[in-house]
């Protein structure tokens, strides 16, 4: 229920966050699950715990395993599990699938590639970026904050992009790399005021308490390459990331080109283990581009499970 996969490369830094949530003031203890051995908090150790974070500085293949984090609230101890896998560095240039983060898509006018997991680290700009193991050079490539911007994107820009940065811990530097695929949508077309295909305005979505639920926000913005088109979910008028409920996350879908040639975007809102209080929230699907913003509101209602008798 409270478990998360994390991976990294040997001799690089890896920082993992406890999957169990809690207030920042709460003490978090970490253990190596197989031996129940406590992870030290002293920073002189190669592997040490720092609040909600578990730090491997640097990581070793032998560190692979399941780690238990216990968040100590004023009342009860709450447990989460981090499944960590550390891989040997590849001698060739190919990055295996198991080391890849989620694929992102771009277009001629919208080509941001975010560096995965970087928010967990203490790093300073600029990032180094590589495509298929080659360092990116030239004025078309701009490393900005935690993402790469590619100007005048072409089909040939598709590929595997690796960000490399330095994590600093008490004056010591550790390398971190993360790789994700980038795909290019190369179309010519036009832009329209956003049209939300789903959900319908004021839709009532039936969900079952205790089950998982998905809401898809799908909108079309015109034909071909779109500039500054986005779909997103809000909860009670608040961004998902700011709302602070770990069970409710949004997951970006791929650009879609339907049979009518329209350029559309999806954003899936995943609600894990639906709770009664989720029914009190207002779910807004927002679609926006240069023409403006359109909003469709969804509310959840309780679906009573039907008894199936043989």
């Amino acid at each position: 229920k409270f478990s998360k996969q994390s991976w990294g490369l040997e001799n690089e830094a890896l920082i993992v966050r406890c999957p169990r949530q809690g207030k920042p003031s709460y003490t978090v203890d970490w253990y190596y699950s197989q031996t129940n051995k406590s992870i030290p908090t002293q920073e002189r150790n190669r592997v040490f715990a720092s609040g909600q974070l578990l730090k491997f500085l640097p990581a070793a293949v032998a560190d692979s395993g399941i780690y238990t984090c216990i968040v100590r609230s004023p009342t009860f101890n709450r447990t989460g599990y981090a499944n960590v896998t550390i891989y040997k560095k590849q001698s060739d240039c190919n990055v295996p699938d198991y080391l890849m983060y989620s694929t992102v898509s771009g277009s001629e006018k919208n080509s941001k590639i975010y560096c995965p997991t970087i928010d967990l680290y203490n790093w300073t700009a600029p990032l180094e970026w590589f495509k298929n193991c080659q360092a990116l050079q030239g004025s078309r490539y701009r490393a900005h904050k935690s993402f790469l911007v590619i100007d005048n994107v072409m089909t040939e820009d598709a590929g595997d992009y690796t960000c490399k940065f330095i994590h600093n811990e008490n004056g010591a530097n550790y390398s971190v790399t993360a790789t994700r695929s980038f795909t290019v949508k190369d179309e010519q077309g036009f832009s329209l005021f956003p049209v939300i295909g789903a959900p319908a305005q004021n839709e009532i979505k039936e969900v079952e308490i205790g089950k998982n639920a998905n809401l898809t926000c799908s909108a079309c913005f015109g034909k071909g390459t779109q500039f500054l088109a986005a779909v997103l979910w809000q909860l009670n008028g608040t961004k998902i990331t700011d709302f602070g409920e770990p069970r409710i996350q949004q997951e970006e879908g791929q650009n879609q080109s339907f049979s009518n040639g329209l350029a559309c975007l999806d954003m899936v809102l995943r609600i894990a283990d639906v709770k009664e209080e989720d029914l009190l929230l207002q779910y807004d699907c927002l679609a926006l581009n240069l023409h403006g913003l359109r909003r469709h509101t969804v509310r959840l209602s309780r679906k009573n499970p039907i008894d199936h008798h043989s």
């Epitope: 207030k23 003031s25 004023p74 009664e276």
Partner: antibody
Amino acid sequence: QVQLVQSGAEVKKPGASVKVSCKASGYTFTDYELHWVRQAPGQGLEWMGTIDPETGDTVYNQKFKARVTMTADKSTSTAYMELSSLRSEDTAVYYCTRAFYNDYDDGFAYWGQGTLVTVSS
Amino acid sequence: EIVMTQSPATLSLSPGERATLSCSVSSSVSYMHWYQQKPGQAPRRLIYDTSKLASGIPARFSGSGSGTDYTLTISSLEPEDAAVYYCQQWNSSPLTFGGGTKVEIK
């Protein structure tokens, strides 16, 4: 919707015990710690303790530790608070309550209607 | 045990006036929750985590503070705001409440 429905009013003699029930509905009972808070007539609120219905683990306010027992029945989604060796100053309204999101301990968002326990000889 | 002291004990104001309720804590806490209670009713959560407005609570209610001093503010009193208001800490066990501030509307 989330509901906490408590048992009815009780009149007890000093030295007796009382057991108040709190039936939860509208959410997964084992996902949330349930707390008990009492309020003497014209007085403020006093936290008595809490139970994790999943494990049955309890944390009691030291003031009540010797006399209070909190239990939970997962099969009926009902929590119980038993207070023994009653005295007149235990006359109060007893509430069961829970947080909005459990991990964040974000205040008591849901309350039962309260159970008046009167201790009188 | 963390002791919570609320002041004033009673606050008597006219509709439209600003109400400021204080909660002083015997040792520093990270967050404060506030509740409203009307006669014969269970308490109702108003503010959680010091400054976050609970669902369904009017925006005239706000919370602030840190460490040992916290404040609940009602920017413009309405007649229905007549009630007793309690602060509560969830920083350490036992969880404790303040003694309450009674708000009367003239």
